[in-house]
């Protein structure tokens, strides 16, 4: 109706890098900008994904390099994280959320894949992480070794090769293990500490070059007490699990001080392992049962999980599976394993500013089921598995329904703000709940919409509109881009009224009759008033439409409802010929070249492109008869 | 030659405080522990206090714990035993005894005893 | 706490007598019980250590046993000088408390 297609702004970047994922419109102090997400981008050996600034009028784009923010004490895995896969402004700071919800640490021996998003403020710096769904690792752990270096260990060798193997076994990194070892004998030292080392090559090597101090007497406790009091507070950390591994080959010269040295490690929750080296007692034929028991005493409870003993010093190395799987074992405490919590929820795959925060949609939360997370100043809030049984039955836990595939709100006047989140595949059709979120992690779901057909993806985008601008939601769009129809994925934009406090069915949008795949309702964005009519205005993309070309469709808004048939539609090939996938980001809530009227931002593969507003001249024919 | 040594006891009027020492010879204090055993007159003998020379851990029997405390000064080969408090029934010949590894946790030496009277 | 009771507290024997003593500790121990002997206006004196094992210089007539919870010391063949008290004393594990028995009194009938 009223864009401007004759001089587009196309602002090219990386079809590689699949810039023009995301766009959103940005403003500083005056300054018009777009913000781009390109999350398949390189940053040096990793496909990390980025988001640009590009100025609106001319001039190039500025990669944030927001792909090289760390995470302090995780061993992150950035590659293929997607960043820029969401976006989310706050209108309130112009600061904006920027999502990797393929973000992954290590633990253990897996990744989990939790997500992170990077919160930019107005000025394009980087502010703060946004990690609601990181949790420690199970590997978080400080894990002392208590070797017994007096001269009746014997060939030392042998404990060196074992001390070597079982490192080895450790997931050592920032976040998870940090391992450090003391030995004893007459006296105790610190061969190196618990923050040392960061990886297990520098631990290994540094264990290498350990050498036998000798001695002629074992004082064992003095050796734990020494670990327990010294070396897991010389670089131990706070919340990390403590574990002893405690390696003798004999009785102990102060056996009597073990009672208050072991009640202290228990005090402080430090797990013990104990391992008996018999050789001393083979080699001469002693009965090592007084050993054994004093050994099992330092042991944690029960002793079959926690005491190991061998016949010599060679025997070590038959013990070194068992025993790093024991202290894995650690990992798995109090927990299902089969099951998913928040380990691999993707959070940020989608997000929403609220007036308290950010919502955060995390599809692989609960075994794929999804779930939605908030982010608040105060803290953060992770609903429940319980708290959508409700509307996700038990019985369809493994279907992987995406909840969380998007994530927006509305705004009742009897209720206020709701959220709303889209769950695309739930029972194969697709669902839409509107809910708020407690403290306590539990969840109101006020309504639920189910899609019509399986594969559909109802609910894969979800846009809330604000027709006449009273700060109450008039109509809520849901998408169902894969909707089948006339054998194509041609999609559906289904249309719902506010009524009192519940949403109802109104029809659904009229896209164009080609047939070819569109994907009409890939995204859906609730732009300010286009046509000067003091409605706002709902654009849709359909980026499959004209052979992956991509189009746009704008629909008018008027008296608290929406025009269900397009008053523009833009194609791909009339605004500049190579663009693919046009439409499958929009924003259009600025007026970018100041005047006065909003202009849109579209993105496509490799492109954003800017649609700028004409004004409309509302002429009033009038007609006067002489005479009359 | 392993040998111990008491000194400091004597005569002491209830609710007063004596200061017994232990000092060892022959042996390295640090290696051992220092136990103080009494004995009553005409009677058997009861166990006091113990300490650990080099980690300090210390242990009282209930009779005496709060008013009684072992320490050890290993530059001195020393043990002491401070006594406050001190009643009619902690009227007796207080002896040190050695107590390590080596003797399996026995109390292989004595010392020869020192008097403590605790009388009005 | 672990107590240590002794008995008999008194006993008269001649020269050449064989002499037994017993503790019974009132749980189980582990096999840190030593026994001790103490003349009048002396300090005692370690005789066995471990349950079983002789001291050194201590003649080998003195011997000690365990079975289950009770300790026995026995002097085969009782001599002149071992007219005396003779006390059982057990070590708490891994802690140095110690408990003495009440004493037997070995005097000559």
């Known amino acids: 109706f009223n864009m401007d297609t004759r001089k587009p702004r196309v602002i090219p970047g990386s079809r590689t890098a699949f810039f023009g994922y995301t766009v959103q419109q940005h403003d500083i102090s005056g300054n018009k900008w777009l913000v781009v997400g390109a999350p398949l981008e390189t940053n040096g050996y990793q496909k990390t994904g980025d988001v640009y600034k590009c100025p609106v009028i001319h001039g190039n784009c500025t990669k944030l390099n927001l792909g090289r923010v760390t995470l302090s004490n995780v061993s992150e895995r950035k590659d293929n994280m997607r960043l820029g896969l969401s976006l989310a402004t706050n209108p309130k700071d112009n600061s904006f959320l920027a999502c990797s919800p393929l973000w992954s640490h290590e633990c253990g021996s897996s990744y989990y894949t939790t997500g992170m998003c990077s919160r930019v403020n107005s000025n394009f710096r980087f502010s703060k992480t946004v990690a609601p769904a990181l949790q420690r690792c199970q590997t978080y752990m400080d894990i002392v070794i208590v070797l017994d270096g007096s001269n009746s260990i014997y060939p030392w060798v042998e404990v060196q090769h074992f001390l070597i193997n079982i490192l080895k076994k450790f997931y050592i990194g920032p976040g998870q293990i940090q391992v450090g070892v003391v030995q004893y004998g007459e006296d105790v030292v610190h061969e190196f500490h618990l923050n040392d080392y960061r990886s297990v090559k520098d631990v290994v090597e540094a264990a290498s070059h350990i050498e036998q101090r000798g001695g002629t007497e074992t004082r064992t406790a003095f050796g734990i007490e020494f670990a327990r009091s010294e070396a897991f507070q010389k670089g131990g950390r706070k919340g990390a699990k403590k574990v002893m591994i405690v390696i003798t080959d004999g009785e102990s010269h102060d056996s009597p001080d073990l009672e208050k040295v072991i009640q202290q490690s228990e005090r402080d929750n430090v797990t013990r392992y104990a391992v008996a080296v018999l050789g001393y007692y083979n080699r001469r034929g002693i009965n090592p049962e007084t050993f054994l028991n004093e050994i099992k005493y330092i042991a944690s409870d029960p002793d079959d999980k926690h005491f190991f003993n061998v016949t010599d010093e060679a025997a070590l190395k038959d013990i070194v599976d068992a025993l790093g799987d024991r202290i894995f074992s650690l990992e798995g405490t109090n927990k299902n394993e089969t099951s998913f919590g928040l380990e691999m929820s993707q959070t940020g795959f989608s997000s929403h500013v609220v007036e308290d925060g950010v919502l955060l949609g995390a599809v692989g939360a609960y075994d794929w089921n999804g779930a939605v997370l908030k982010e608040t100043s105060a803290g953060k809030v992770i609903p429940l598995r319980e708290s959508y049984l409700k509307e996700f039955p038990e019985e369809l836990k493994n279907h992987g329904a995406y909840l969380g595939y998007t994530v927006t709100s509305v705004v009742s006047s009897r209720q206020g703000r709701v959220y709303v989140a889209g769950a695309p595949r739930f029972n194969h059709t697709g669902k839409v709940i509107l809910f708020t979120m407690h403290n306590n992690r539990s969840l109101t779901i006020h309504q639920a919409m189910r899609g019509q057909q399986i594969g559909s993806y109802f609910g894969s985008e979800i846009t809330s509109v604000d027709i006449d601008g009273d700060g109450v939601t008039d109509v809520l769009l849901v998408g169902a881009p894969m909707y089948f129809n006339e054998g194509r994925e041609r999609g559906k934009v289904y249309v719902y009224e506010l009524r009192q406090n519940l949403f109802v069915y109104n029809g659904t949008l009229k896209d164009s009759h080609s047939y070819q795949n569109a994907r009409f309702g890939s995204s859906i964005a609730s732009v300010r008033d286009l046509n000067q009519d003091s409605y706002n205005d709902v654009v849709v993309g359909a980026p499959l439409e004209d052979n992956h070309a991509g189009a746009i469709y704008i629909f008018h808004g008027f008296r608290g409802s929406i025009l269900k048939t397009p008053k523009q539609r833009i194609t791909a090939s009339e605004l500049a010929t190579g663009l693919q996938y046009f439409g499958c980001s929009i924003h259009g809530q600025l007026d970018l070249n100041e005047d006065g009227l909003i202009d849109l931002a579209v993105g496509a593969l490799g492109n954003a492109v800017i649609l700028w507003s004409r004004p409309v001249v509302q002429i009033n024919a009038s007609l006067h008869f002489e005479p009359s | 030659e392993v040998q111990l040594v008491e000194s400091g006891g004597g005569l002491v009027q209830p609710g007063g405080s004596l200061r017994l020492s232990c000092a060892a010879s022959?042996?390295?204090?640090?290696?051992?522990?220092i136990h103080w055993v009494r004995q009553a007159p005409g009677k058997g003998l009861e166990w006091v206090a113990s300490?650990?020379?080099?980690?300090?851990?210390?242990y009282y029997a209930d009779s005496v714990k709060g008013r009684f405390t072992i320490s050890a000064d290993t530059s001195k080969n020393t043990a002491y035993l401070q006594m406050n408090s001190l009643r009619a029934e902690d009227t007796a010949v207080y002896y040190c005894?050695?107590?390590?590894?080596?003797?399996?946790?026995?109390?292989?030496?004595w010392g020869q005893g020192t008097l403590v009277t605790v009388s009005s | 706490d672990i107590q240590m009771t002794q008995s008999p507290s008194s006993l008269s024997a001649s020269v050449g007598d064989r002499v037994t003593i017993t503790c019974r500790a009132s749980?189980?121990?582990?096999?840190?019980v030593a026994w001790y002997q103490q003349k009048p206006g002396k300090a005692p004196k370690l005789l066995i250590y471990?349950?079983?094992s002789l001291d050194s210089g201590v003649p080998s007539r003195f011997s000690g046993s365990r079975s289950g919870t009770d300790f026995t010391l026995t002097i085969s063949s009782l001599q002149p000088e071992d007219f005396a008290t003779y006390y059982c004393?057990?070590?708490?594990?891994?802690?140095?408390?110690?408990?003495f028995g009440q004493g037997t009194k070995v005097e000559i009938k």
């Open positions: 005894a050695r107590y390590w590894y080596y003797s399996a946790w026995a109390l292989d030496y």
């Open positions: 022959g042996f390295n204090l640090y290696s051992s522990y």
């Open positions: 300490i650990s020379s080099y980690s300090s851990y210390t």
């Open positions: 749980q189980s121990v582990s096999s840190a």
């Open positions: 471990s349950a079983s």
């Open positions: 004393q057990q070590s708490a594990p891994y802690s140095s408390l110690i408990t």
